[in-house]
C-alpha cells in the first residue's frame, strides 16, 4: 500500500458525505446504495463513521460530471479516466468526481459504480495507489465478480496505518496476495499458453515468459472477466490455440481471452462419472492427443482427438505414478517430463523411465 506524501488524513473519525447529483445510468436508490456500500468497505475495518447529508457542505462531496467540470482536472469522454478523488483536506479535499461519460452500473457491464467508488473513497481517506495487483487501490480497474466483496489485506493494512483498526470487523477474511517465495506455497493450476507459463493461485495467476525469471502477477479476472475468481485445473491444446479451464463441475474453452461459444460445459460431457465434483489438475500431451484429468486419488485419460474417455480408466494415481502421493494439485509437461505438484512439493517425473527423478519446492517454478 501507499499513503499520500505528508501522510494526509482526516483528524476526525466522524465524516460526512453528500451526493450532489446523480448519473442517468442508474436509479437514485441504486446510486445511494453503491456509495453507502463503498463507504462501509472502509468503515468496517477502521473507527471511521460516514453520515450522509442531503444539503450543505460535507467533508466528501460526491458528484458526476463530464469533461471540464470545475476543478481543472477535466474528464476525457468515454473510457480512459473513470473518476478521481482528492486526498483529505479542506475545500476540494476528500471530494470524489465520477465521469458521467462512462456507463455506470451495479453489474459487470460498463463500470461498476460501487467498485470505482470504493477505490476513490480510498483516495478520499488518504490512500494512494498500491503496487499490489490484488489491492482495491491498484490503479487498473478489474471487475471482481458478483460475489460478496472482500477488502484485500493490502488495503486493510494501508487504511489501518492511517486510522487504526475498528472495534469489530464483520468480515475478518481479507484476501492476501500470494507471495511466490512463501515456502509453504501450493498451486491451483498450471498451463502453458502460447509459449508462456500460467501459474494459478487463488484469484491470481503468474505469467512466466520463457528465459525470464520475474513472473508477472495478474488477477485472473483482469484477463477473463467471465471466469470464476479461482480455478481448479487448466491445460493447453496448442494445435487448436485453446486452453481449457476447470472449476467445480464446469469447464471453459478459451481462445486468447475469448470464451468459445457453448461454454461453460459440464465435466460429465467429457465422460466423467456424475460423482466427480471437480478436476484437481489436468495435462495435455500434444504428441498423443491425450489429456490426463486428476480428481481425488484417481486419474482419467481423455482422447482429445476422438472426444472420448479412454477405456481402463479411472486408475489410481499411486499406481500409474508411484511416489507422487495420492493427489495432484497442479501438473504440466515439458520436454518429456511431467511436473506434479502436491502441496508445497513438486515431483519431476520422467515419462521415458516412468519414475521420479527430482523432488523440488513447488515455488521453484517461480524461480524461488
Amino acid at each position: 500500500y501507499n499513503v499520500f506524501p505528508r501522510t494526509l488524513k482526516w483528524s476526525k473519525m466522524n465524516l460526512t458525505y453528500r451526493i450532489v447529483n446523480y448519473t442517468p445510468d442508474m436509479t437514485h436508490s441504486e446510486v445511494e446504495k453503491a456509495f453507502k456500500k463503498a463507504f462501509k468497505v472502509w468503515s468496517d475495518v477502521t473507527p471511521l463513521n460516514f453520515t450522509r447529508l442531503h444539503d450543505g457542505i460535507a467533508d466528501i462531496m460526491i458528484s458526476f460530471g463530464i469533461k471540464e467540470h470545475g476543478d481543472f482536472y477535466p474528464f476525457d469522454g468515454p473510457s480512459g479516466l473513470l473518476a478521481h478523488a482528492f486526498p483529505p483536506g479542506p475545500n476540494y479535499g476528500g471530494d470524489a468526481h465520477f465521469d458521467d461519460d462512462e456507463t455506470w452500473t451495479s453489474s459487470s457491464k460498463g463500470y461498476n459504480l460501487f467498485l470505482v467508488a470504493a477505490h476513490e473513497f480510498g483516495h478520499s481517506l488518504g490512500l494512494d495507489h498500491s503496487k499490489d495487483p490484488g489491492a482495491l487501490m491498484f490503479p487498473i480497474y478489474t471487475y471482481t465478480g458478483k460475489s460478496h466483496f472482500m477488502l484485500p489485506d493490502d488495503d486493510v493494512q494501508g487504511i489501518q496505518s492511517l486510522y487504526g483498526p475498528g472495534d469489530e470487523d464483520p468480515n475478518p477474511k481479507h484476501p492476501k496476495t500470494p507471495d511466490k517465495c512463501d515456502p509453504s506455497l501450493s498451486l491451483d493450476a498450471i498451463t502453458s499458453l502460447r509459449g508462456e507459463t500460467m501459474i494459478f493461485k487463488d484469484r491470481f495467476f503468474w505469467r512466466l515468459h520463457p528465459q525470464q525469471v520475474d513472473a508477472e502477477l495478474f488477477l485472473t479476472k483482469s484477463f477473463w472477466p467471465e471466469l470464476p475468481n479461482r480455478i481448479d485445473a487448466a491445460y493447453e491444446h496448442p494445435s487448436h490455440d485453446l486452453i481449457f479451464i476447470f472449476r467445480g463441475r464446469k469447464f471453459w474453452a478459451l481462445n486468447g481471452y475469448d470464451i468459445l461459444e457453448g461454454y461453460p460445459k459440464k465435466i460429465s460431457e467429457l465422460g466423467l462419472p456424475k460423482e466427480v465434483k471437480k478436476i484437481s489438475a489436468a495435462v495435455h500431451f500434444e504428441d498423443t492427443g491425450k489429456t490426463l484429468l486428476f480428481s481425488g486419488n484417481q486419474v482419467w485419460r481423455y482422447d482429445d482427438t476422438n472426444h472420448i474417455m479412454d477405456k481402463d480408466y479411472p486408475r489410481l494415481i499411486e499406481e500409474d505414478f508411484p511416489g507422487i502421493g495420492d493427489k495432484v494439485d497442479a501438473v504440466y509437461e515439458k520436454n518429456g517430463y511431467i511436473y506434479f505438484f502436491n502441496g508445497p512439493i513438486q515431483f519431476e517425473y520422467s515419462i521415458w523411465s516412468n519414475r521420479i527423478v527430482r523432488v523440488m519446492p513447488a515455488n521453484s517454478i517461480l524461480w524461488c
Epitope: 480512459g80 473513470l82 508462456e196
Partner: nanobody, 120 residues
C-alpha cells in the same frame, strides 16, 4: 507492450470506399478501448471512431453514417469501413488502444499510421 499494426490505406476517388484494419499483437493482454484517430496535414489528431469500454461505438459527427467500426475479438483486430469518402477525409489514420484505469491516465498505444488520400 501492445503493438498495433494498421493496413488498408491508399488513394481513392471521392465517393469511393476503403477498409482499414488494425491488429493488436498483445498475447492475451486485455485491451479496454480500441479504435481509430486521424491527423490531416497541419491539424491535430482527432477521434474518428472507437469501441468504448462498455462495447458501445462512438463516432466523430463528420463520419456518422459513412464510416463503420467493427472488430474481431478472437483476433484482437479492429476494422474501419469507410464509404462515400470525401477529400476532407484525407489524413493519416492511426489505430489506438487503451487499458482500463480508475483515475490515472491509461497508457496510450498507437499504430504507425496508414495514409488515406481522397482525390480525383
Amino acid at each position: 507492450e501492445v503493438q498495433l499494426v494498421e493496413s488498408g490505406g491508399g488513394l481513392v476517388q471521392p465517393g469511393g470506399s476503403l477498409r482499414l484494419s488494425c491488429s493488436a499483437s498483445t498475447g492475451i493482454f486485455r485491451i479496454n478501448t480500441m479504435g481509430w484517430h486521424r491527423q490531416a496535414p497541419g491539424k491535430q489528431r482527432d477521434l474518428v471512431a472507437t469501441f468504448t469500454s462498455d462495447d458501445n461505438t462512438k463516432y466523430a459527427d463528420s463520419v456518422k453514417g459513412r464510416f463503420t467500426i467493427s472488430r474481431d475479438n478472437a483476433e484482437n483486430t479492429v476494422y474501419l469501413q469507410m464509404n462515400d469518402l470525401k477529400p476532407e477525409d484525407t489524413a493519416v489514420y492511426y489505430c489506438h488502444a487503451t487499458t482500463v484505469m480508475y483515475d490515472s491516465n491509461s497508457p496510450d498505444y498507437w499504430g504507425q499510421g496508414t495514409q488515406v488520400t481522397v482525390s480525383s
